[in-house]
C-alpha cells in the first residue's frame, strides 16, 4: 500500500496473507471457514495461509495449508478479465474476534462510497519496502466512465476503480487479492494498476465482487 | 545508478553452446520488481527476444528458440546468463541483455519496457 | 504470434521536420506498446512505453500515441542527433515479446 497508514489492529479480521513458502505472494479475504476469496492471477500449486494477525509472519497466527484453488473459468491471463479464484483450505479455520468471515454484498456500491483497501504490499516504488504491519488506505469508488478515460479498452465490465484524485495512495506489488472494503461489505479485490504505483490519478483497478456473488456461492457448493 | 555488461566468447564453432553472462552492478538483480532479458540483433538486422527470466527463476523464451534455450539467475554473483545449444551461422549477432521494467503491478506485471541495456557483445558462429 | 509492422522501413528528413512513424500490431495489443532509438553501433534506447508514456530524462519532442492495433511515434522538431533508427516493440503476457522491423531516419 503506498501512502497508507497502519491499520487499527484486529480491524481486519478476515484478511489473510498467502505465502510462498514465508514469502508473500498475496493478500486474500476470509469468506468462510473453508474458503478464502484472492484474484486469479495469485494462483500456485499449493498455498500457506495466515490468518489472525496484523503481523507478515507472525508465530502466533493461525497458519493452514490450502492445495485447491478454483480460478473462475472465465479468466483470461491476456485481458485479466475475471480475475477472481477461491482457495479451499485443507482444514477449517477456528474462528475467534482475531479470524471471522467477511460480508459478501448485497448490492455494489455507487461510485463516490468509501472504502478501505488493505495489504502488505510494498510501501514504496519502484524500489519495494515490504512492511511487517497490515496497512491501510481510504479510498473512492471510481466511475467506470471516469476510470475509462485513464485506462480506455484495459477496463473490463466486472473491474471495478477506486482512488482519490490527485493523491499518490493507491495499492501495490503483494497486495494482490486483498479486500476492498465498503460500508463493511467486500466490494473489491486488488487486481491490477500501473507501474510505478501511487501516480496520482491512476485509480486501483479491483475485480467488482458482487458481480461475482452467485459464482462464489456456487463454487464453495460444488466443492463443500 | 544500474549498468549491465555482457561478458563471454567472441567466437564460438558451429554444433557447440553460446554462453554468456550478464552482470549487473548498481542495483539487486533480486530485486521484486524487475524481468531480466536477453535480445540478440544480425548484422544489419533488427531486434529479436530471446528469453527472460524473473526474480523467482520463472523463465519465459522465444518459441522460436525455445528447445535451445536456457536462461539462469545467479543472485550471489548479481548476474544472469543465457545458453543457446547447437549454435549454427544464423546465431551469429550482437547480443544485448536487459532490465525489463513491469509497465503495471498484480494481474499487469507481466508487461515490461526494456529501460536498462548492456552495450551487446559480439558473437560469432565460425569454425 | 503477434506480428508488428512498421512504416516506412526508410525515410529522409531535414532538422526541424515533424517526422511520423507508425507501428500496426496483428491483433489489439491495448497501450502496450514501446518505442525505442538505436545508433549505430550502440544499444536500443527507451524513449516511449505503454504507447505513450515519455521515458524520464527523454526530450519532450517526442511523443507516442495509439491504442489497440495502430500507434504512432512522432518527432515534432528534428534534431541532429535524432538521426538513428526506431523500433516499436509490444510486450503481450504470452511470448514472444516482439520488435518492428525498424525505421531508419536519414537526412535529407
Known amino acids: 500500500i503506498i501512502d497508507g497508514y497502519k491499520c487499527k489492529e484486529g480491524s481486519h479480521p478476515w484478511q489473510v496473507a498467502l505465502l510462498k513458502g514465508n514469502q508473500l505472494h498475496c493478500g486474500g479475504v476470509l469468506v468462510d471457514k473453508y474458503w478464502v476469496l484472492t484474484a486469479a492471477h495469485c494462483k500456485m500449486g499449493q498455498y500457506q495461509v495466515q490468518l489472525g494477525s496484523d503481523k507478515i509472519g507472525d508465530q502466533s497466527a493461525q497458519k493452514i495449508k490450502a492445495t485447491k484453488s478454483f480460478r473462475h473459468p472465465g479468466y483470461s491471463t491476456k485481458t485479466h478479465v475475471n480475475d477472481i479464484m477461491l482457495v479451499r483450505l485443507d482444514e477449517p479455520v477456528k474462528m475467534s474476534s482475531k479470524v471471522e468471515a467477511v460480508q459478501l454484498p448485497e448490492h455494489c456500491e455507487p461510485p463516490g462510497t468509501s472504502c478501505t483497501v488493505s495489504g502488505w504490499g510494498t510501501t514504496t516504488s519502484p524500489d519495494v519496502t515490504f512492511p511487517s504491519d497490515l496497512m491501510c488506505s481510504d479510498v473512492k469508488l471510481i466511475s467506470s466512465r471516469e476510470c475509462k478515460k485513464v485506462y480506455k479498452d484495459l477496463l473490463g465490465k466486472t473491474m471495478l476503480c477506486a482512488g482519490i484524485p490527485d493523491s499518490k495512495t493507491n495499492t501495490c506489488n503483494g497486495d494482490s487479492g486483498g479486500p476492498l472494503v465498503c460500508n463493511d461489505t467486500l466490494q473489491g479485490l486488488v487486481s491490477w494498476g500501473t507501474y510505478p504505483c501511487g501516480q496520482p490519478n491512476d485509480p486501483g483497478v479491483y475485480t467488482q465482487v458482487c458481480k461475482y456473488k452467485r459464482w462464489v456461492m456456487e463454487t464453495m457448493k460444488t466443492h463443500r | 545508478q544500474l549498468q549491465l555488461q555482457e561478458s563471454g566468447p567472441g567466437l564460438v564453432k558451429p554444433s557447440e553452446t553460446l554462453s554468456l553472462t550478464c552482470t549487473v552492478s548498481?542495483?539487486?538483480?533480486?530485486?521484486?520488481?524487475?524481468?531480466w532479458v536477453w535480445i540478440r540483433q544480425p548484422p544489419g538486422k533488427g531486434l529479436e527476444w530471446i528469453g527472460s527470466i524473473d526474480y523467482s527463476g520463472d523463465t519465459y523464451y522465444n518459441p522460436s528458440l525455445k528447445s535451445r534455450v536456457t536462461i539462469s539467475v545467479d543472485t550471489s554473483k548479481n548476474q544472469f546468463s543465457l545458453k543457446l545449444s547447437s549454435v549454427t551461422a544464423a546465431d551469429t549477432a550482437v547480443y544485448y541483455c536487459a532490465r525489463g521494467r513491469p509497465l503495471g503491478y498484480g494481474a499487469r506485471h507481466y508487461y515490461y519496457a526494456m529501460d536498462v541495456w548492456g552495450q551487446g557483445t559480439t558473437v560469432t558462429v565460425s569454425s | 504470434d503477434i506480428q508488428m509492422t512498421q512504416s516506412p522501413s526508410s525515410l529522409s528528413a531535414s532538422v526541424g521536420d515533424r517526422v511520423t512513424i507508425t507501428c500496426r500490431a496483428s491483433?489489439?495489443?491495448?497501450?502496450?506498446l514501446n518505442w525505442y532509438q538505436q545508433k549505430p553501433g550502440k544499444a536500443p534506447k527507451l524513449l516511449i512505453y505503454?504507447?505513450?508514456s515519455l521515458q524520464s530524462g527523454v526530450p519532450s519532442r517526442f511523443s507516442g500515441s495509439g491504442s489497440g492495433t495502430d500507434f504512432t511515434l512522432t518527432i515534432s522538431s528534428l534534431q541532429p542527433e535524432d538521426f538513428a533508427t526506431y523500433y516499436c516493440?509490444?510486450?503481450?503476457?504470452?511470448?514472444?515479446?516482439?520488435f518492428g522491423g525498424g525505421t531508419k531516419v536519414e537526412i535529407k
Open positions: 491483433q489489439s495489443i491495448s497501450s502496450y
Open positions: 505503454s504507447a505513450s
Open positions: 548498481g542495483g539487486s538483480i533480486s530485486s521484486l520488481d524487475y524481468y
Open positions: 516493440q509490444q510486450s503481450p503476457y504470452f511470448p514472444p515479446l516482439t
